[in-house]
């Protein structure tokens, strides 16, 4: 059996949206499946790796990689998203190319990032952790550690820097899969909203999902000693 | 608010070395992203830009001049000092210190300027 | 280095008149680019970053255009305390390079 709930709730985009959360039914009347799995529940992709799982985190993240920082015109805000979700006319798609990228170090001025601009994260303002020296940040924002400190300066200049973010990464369902959501959605969903974070890339959703012990590598799940909890 | 003041001598004499000081308020040079720097302008000409130093020590010169530089800064003290060793009448400029940031590589508050002659 | 040059080397407008200042890269340097405007005895000051990003504080009748080699600097509708040189420097590359200036006359 199923429940469904239906809720008109803050999108991406800033408009209220009806959305449906779809919720399926313990047979037994008892806790749901998500809560079954934080308990310790026989949940093989907790256990070992999920093929399926893996070409899912792996196809968003491809598609984050060709992400970019959609500005809305009006100021209301911005989302990180692909360019053909981003409004050609109410507002701007923050996307380094051509070599408008800031440079990778500066050392090398003339090498350029290609990969980005990202929503409120940018190498140039980060200050823990730096990029800079050994720790230089690659030019595959999927591979951008979460920023813990910013600069201490109010206006940066940049358009994807000082807008107001409307969208972070969002855990949501038993599959982990991950979406740049509103809090409200997030929430609406049923979902773990990542607060600190601004890429997909940068949580570990099925770790979320699991529960229990986190996982060694949070790539690789291992809690094989569901086995003998239930 | 940001403001920097050159110092230094108004005439040198041929080979010898001029010190230039760059004194800061407004802002700390420990401060993440920002540098100080020497740029000059030979008068009636353009500008050239001769070297930076930035928060975290790093140094960058014009290599055209590099070995006849040397940038240090003293954080404590708001100041960036600049050495230019065997002047030439050449080198007759004026001289400017200005901030730089890592966001763009531009500059973007300057000092007045100090006139250097070079002659004997 | 990468080399900029400025055209015209010197122009006499008169008040109201729109202005326009070229700046060449000899090579690309996508948008790494900015304008300093610089009055008599005076030092210069930043008027637009990154070719086309305006700066706080200055008026909005100065606006950048350009990318890859070639920039355009637009003064709309002049006015006597605009009578400056006028610098574009690149920021793609080490070392940084400023173009030789342009003098601008109020007839």
């Known amino acids: 059996a199923q429940h469904v709930t239906t809720q008109l709730v803050l999108r991406n985009k800033g408009v209220y949206e009806s959305v449906k959360y779809i919720q399926q039914e313990n047979f037994w009347i008892g806790p749901s499946s998500i809560d079954l799995i934080h308990l310790g529940a026989k949940f093989s992709p907790c256990i070992r790796k999920d093929q399926q799982i893996e070409q899912l985190v792996l196809r968003e993240r491809d598609l984050e990689r060709d992400s970019g920082c959609c500005v809305q015109n009006d100021h209301s805000g911005c989302i990180q998203t692909q360019r053909k979700d981003c409004s050609e006319t109410l507002a701007t798609f923050v996307k380094w190319q051509d070599d408008t990228g800031p440079p990778m170090d500066k050392s090398d001025l003339g090498q350029k990032r290609t990969s980005g601009a990202v929503c409120h994260q940018d190498p140039r303002t980060c200050e823990e952790p730096a990029s800079s020296g050994a720790h230089i940040w690659p030019d595959d924002i999927t591979k951008w550690p979460i920023c813990t400190e910013q600069a201490k300066s109010n206006r940066t200049g940049f358009l994807h820097m000082d807008c107001q973010i409307k969208g972070r990464p969002c855990c949501i369902s038993t599959k982990g899969s991950c979406e740049i959501t509103t809090r409200e959605y997030c929430e609406f969903m049923h979902g773990y909203f990542h607060e600190e974070a601004t890429l997909c890339s940068q949580v570990h959703c099925l770790d979320k999902v699991c529960g229990l012990l986190p996982f060694l590598n949070p790539e690789v799940p291992d809690q094989f000693y569901r086995l003998w909890l239930s | 608010q940001v403001t920097l003041r050159e110092s230094g001598p108004a005439l040198v004499k041929p080979t010898q070395t001029l010190t230039l000081t760059c004194t800061f308020s407004g802002f700390s040079l420990s401060t993440f992203a920002l540098g100080v720097g020497w740029i000059r302008q030979p008068p009636g000409k353009a500008l050239e830009w001769l070297a930076h130093i930035w928060w975290d020590e790093d140094k960058y010169y014009n290599p055209a001049l590099k070995s006849r530089l040397t940038i240090s800064k003293d954080t404590s003290k708001n100041q960036v000092v600049l050495t230019i060793t065997n002047m030439d009448p050449v080198d007759t400029a004026t001289y400017y210190c200005?901030?730089?940031?890592?966001?763009?590589?531009?500059?973007?508050?300057w000092g007045q300027g100090t006139l250097v002659t070079v002659s004997s | 280095e990468i080399v900029m040059t400025q055209s015209p080397d010197f122009q006499s407008v008169t008040p109201k008149e729109k202005v326009t200042i070229t700046c060449r890269a000899s090579?690309?340097?996508?948008?790494?680019l900015h304008w300093y405007q610089q009055k008599p005895d005076a030092s210069p000051k930043l008027l637009i970053k990154y070719a086309s990003q305006s700066i706080s504080g200055v008026p909005s009748r100065f606006s950048g255009s350009g990318s890859g080699t070639d920039f355009t600097l637009t003064i709309n509708s002049l006015e006597a305390e605009d009578a400056a040189t006028y610098f574009c420097?690149?920021?793609?590359?080490?070392?940084?390079?400023f173009g030789q200036g342009t003098k601008l006359e109020i007839k």
């Open positions: 200005a901030r730089i940031t890592t966001y763009y590589y531009g500059m973007d508050y």
């Open positions: 090579q690309s340097i996508g948008n790494h």
């Open positions: 420097q690149q920021s793609y590359n080490w070392p940084l390079t």
